[in-house]
Interface confidence: medium
Amino acid sequence: CKAMHVAQPAVVLASSRGIASFVCEYASPGKATEVRVTVLRQADSQVTEVCAATYMMGNELTFLDDSICTGTSSGNQVNLTIQGLRAMDTGLYICKVELMYPPPYYLGIGNGTQIYVIDPEPCPDSDF
């Protein structure tokens, strides 16, 4: 299939509230009108789909209501935010971009962003 370059940061540290954001940028070879973005998680050689959204160029990304992902698009950049992360979710998060329409179909897969999640220390009990 037609390959497309996708760039994303190598490492991101999630916030104490379990939120991680990163930019996924693709080098669009053509004038796509509809783009599909998928976030994959790779851990222990297992790859699972975290979330996916299809959007029209110039419009907002729409993830499913129960998705842990949100995002915005600007040109050939997608700003992705993953919420509700815990330490066990640490892993490599790969951005996959597909230019769906019009033909030809293009596929690009980033090298992945290593997201580190550290669970916050529980607050000590207080006598006050």
């Epitope: 299939c1 037609k2 009108t33 509809e34 299809t54 029209m56 597909e98 769906m100 329409y101 019009p102 033909p103 030809p104 179909y105």
Partner: antibody, heavy 118, light 108 residues
Framework: QVQLVQTGGGVVQPGRSLRLSCAAS????????MSWVRQAPGKGLEWVSA????????YYADSVKGRFTISRDNSKNTLYLQMNSLRAEDTAVYYC???????????WGRATLVTVSS | EIVLTQSPGTLSLSPGERATLSCRAS???????LAWYQQKPGQAPRLLIY???SRATGIPDRFSGSGSGTDFTLTISRLEPEDFAVYYC?????????FGGGTKVEIK
């Protein structure tokens, strides 16, 4: 295996309208881009129109642009082709077909004959 | 628009013979995005080959595709009685999607 059942063909006068339907079995209908392809009597195949799986993107051949409208209702697993201002040269057998990601046609309906004649 | 020209228009052969069908594009078909279809009278087309050389599910291995750029070939190694039909090529490397005019393979 998805199956495509077409309805809505017939004889119509020039300038009039007709709507074709293509009902798909299977729960993955919204995963497929869909197209309409036609074949004039004794002639070859001509791609007419396509629509993305979400229905958000539509494409037309120049020969039908502005006259035909492709749409889909994913809740009903049905594809439509609204044909307005029909001309004699639109007379053909019309096929609905599923598109792979790569835009070849992997599954075809059984055909609907549209005859435009006065 | 990419124009596809198929030749010959008609191929007269006997069962057991080898059939070689040509599809030539007016400009290069990127990534070999070319498909072949078989159509029998009164039936819908059936996908045989995609990506210029990959056989679709359930297609016998006597059908093979080759080529790149502007020249593509469909080969049927040994014609079976059910192979006599019209064959179309289609490019999907650019919009609009276009088909060739077809090659009819008939019994000699």
């Amino acid at each position: 295996q998805v199956q495509l059942v077409q309805t809505g063909g017939g004889v119509v006068q020039p300038g009039r309208s007709l709507r074709l339907s293509c009902a798909a079995s299977g729960s993955t209908f919204s995963s497929y881009a869909m197209s309409w392809v036609r074949q004039a009597p004794g002639k070859g195949l001509e791609w007419v129109s396509a629509i993305s799986g979400s229905g958000g993107s539509t494409y037309y051949a120049d020969s039908v642009k502005g006259r035909f409208t492709i749409s889909r209702d994913n809740s009903k697993n049905t594809l439509y082709l609204q044909m307005n201002s029909l001309r004699a040269e639109d007379t053909a057998v019309y096929y609905c077909a599923t598109n792979s990601l790569y835009w070849y046609f992997d599954l075809w309906g059984r055909a609907t004959l549209v005859t435009v004649s006065s | 628009e990419i124009v596809l020209t198929q030749s010959p228009g008609t191929l007269s052969l006997s069962p057991g013979e080898r059939a070689t069908l040509s599809c030539r594009a007016s400009q290069s078909v990127s990534s070999s995005y070319l498909a072949w279809y078989q159509q029998k009278p009164g039936q819908a087309p059936r996908l045989l080959i995609y990506g210029a050389s990959s056989r679709a599910t359930g297609i016998p291995d006597r059908f093979s595709g080759s080529g790149s750029g502007t020249d593509f070939t469909l080969t049927i190694s040994r014609l079976e009685p059910e192979d006599f039909a019209v064959y179309y090529c289609q490019q999907y490397g650019s919009s609009p999607l276009t088909f060739g005019g077809g090659t009819k393979v008939e019994i000699k």
